[in-house]
Interface confidence: low
């Protein structure tokens, strides 16, 4: 906490500019008017303040807005955002996607901090659902964002938003999350033709049930082994040798290299040896 001291004569700040970097902490506290700071927040980022000086500026804003900053200030926080605690951010009401983008830009390149997680939570809850524009923005900054959500949170994602999802956005999703996302993807892409549909749905297939895999096996999709290895074991087990052969197409030879790994290992153990022999891969059930 900075002590309250009178501002020395001639040092009262008329505007937020580079001269302030030479002010001691107590001078900033005494000589910078909080209302002036709030209206000229956009200038702060262009000035190389020390972290200690930024602490003082934050303190002034906290005093001016004890109930939480207005969005006009939040949008221009810049590096001052890194000084905010999750408790500070919980007081905010962020409704503009531009504000969200501006603050995410500050944290760009780092793993999602508790501050960013709180900010996103406030923003998404304020909107009521993860709309496409928001999802586009969040996955651009944090490819793993979607997979950091609980299945319950994912259930609020409208199918239309699934169009914004890229394969790499699903890399860290676990099966429970894909179980929620897959039906949404199926709905979102339902009007596409066979080959285009498969390209889009492929990343979500870790949540697909047996019946959908059987259907895909009838469509000459040539699923690669990497995708097959991510399928639910319980969805793969009921597939026949013929269905797996059709599903994988020319990639079926890859089963040999994966014969000790799930779900291939478990699937092999469920098949009749005569059926496995038809593949000519030397798989032993």
């Amino acid at each position: 906490e900075v002590e309250k001291t009178a501002c020395p004569s001639g040092k009262k700040a008329r505007e937020i500019d580079e001269s302030l970097i030479f002010y001691k902490k107590w001078e900033l506290e005494a000589c910078v008017d909080a209302a002036l700071l709030a209206t000229q927040m956009d200038r702060v980022n262009a000035i190389p303040f020390t972290y200690e000086q930024l602490d003082v500026l934050k303190h002034k804003l906290d005093e001016l807005y004890p109930q939480g900053y207005p969005e006009s200030v939040i949008q221009h926080l810049g590096y001052l955002f890194l000084k905010m605690s999750p408790e500070d951010i919980r007081k905010w009401n962020v409704t503009s996607l531009e504000t969200l983008k501006a603050l995410l830009e500050v944290n760009k390149g780092h793993e999602m901090s508790p501050q960013v997680a709180t900010l996103i939570d406030r923003f998404v809850k304020g909107r009521g659902q993860l709309d496409k524009d928001t999802l586009d923005t969040l996955t651009a900054f944090y490819p793993g964002y979607l997979c950091s959500l609980s299945p319950e949170e994912l259930s609020s994602v409208p199918p239309s938003s699934i169009w914004a999802v890229r394969p790499q956005d699903l890399d860290t999703c676990d099966p429970r999350q894909l179980d929620v996302l897959y039906p949404k993807a199926r709905l979102a892409f339902q009007n596409m033709n066979g080959s285009e549909y498969f390209v889009k749905i492929q990343s979500f297939l870790g949540g697909a049930p047996t019946e959908d895999l059987k259907a895909l096996s009838q469509q000459n999709v040539s699923m690669d082994l990497a995708t097959f290895m991510k399928l639910r074991t319980d969805a793969v087990l009921p597939l026949t040798v013929a269905e797996v052969q059709k599903l994988l197409g020319p990639h079926v030879e890859g089963l040999k290299a994966e014969e000790r790994h799930r779900p291939v290992r478990d699937w092999i153990l469920r098949q009749r040896q005569d059926d496995l022999d038809t593949l000519g891969l030397g798989l032993q059930g």
Partner: nanobody
Framework: EVQLAESGGGSVQAGGSLRLSCAAS????????MGWFRQAPGKEREGVAA????????VYSDSVGGRFTISRDNTKNMVYLQMNNLEPEDTAMYYC??????????????????WGQGTQVTVSS
């Protein structure tokens, strides 16, 4: 019942290497994110590295990036942490964790439901 057993800790000089192992059982290993965490004396437990079940999207903490490598073998239900160029600051008890709670980042200490007993790593200068 979920069980995690760490091994491979020990004492080493600064600049040396160690390879930690974590043997997992009692759950579907191949479908779960695995994490390595550490706790130095008098400090809070912190995330070191985590690897999703797909082995893509691996994350490291800033303090170990470039020196430590996390890997997994889904056929053996094992996760490993190769630690090179060790520093005295790496001295800590190292823990393996699994069953990541949805909605948490992969290096969040509060993000995992199951933990091993830990293995001690001591780096002297």
């Amino acid at each position: 019942e979920v069980q995690l057993a760490e091994s491979g800790g020990g004492s080493v000089q600064a600049g040396g290497s160690l390879r930690l192992s974590c043997a997992a059982s009692g759950f579907t290993f191949s479908r779960n994110t695995m994490g390595w965490f550490r706790q130095a004396p008098g400090k809070e437990r912190e995330g070191v590295a985590a690897i999703p079940y797909t082995s893509t999207g691996i994350v490291y903490s800033d303090s170990v990036g470039g020196r430590f490598t996390i890997s997994r073998d889904n056929t053996k239900n094992m996760v490993y942490l190769q630690m090179n160029n060790l520093e005295p600051e790496d001295t800590a008890m190292y823990y393996c964790a699994t069953d990541r709670r949805p909605g948490t980042t992969m290096l969040a200490v509060n993000g995992y439901n199951h933990w091993g007993q830990g293995t001690q790593v001591t780096v002297s200068s």
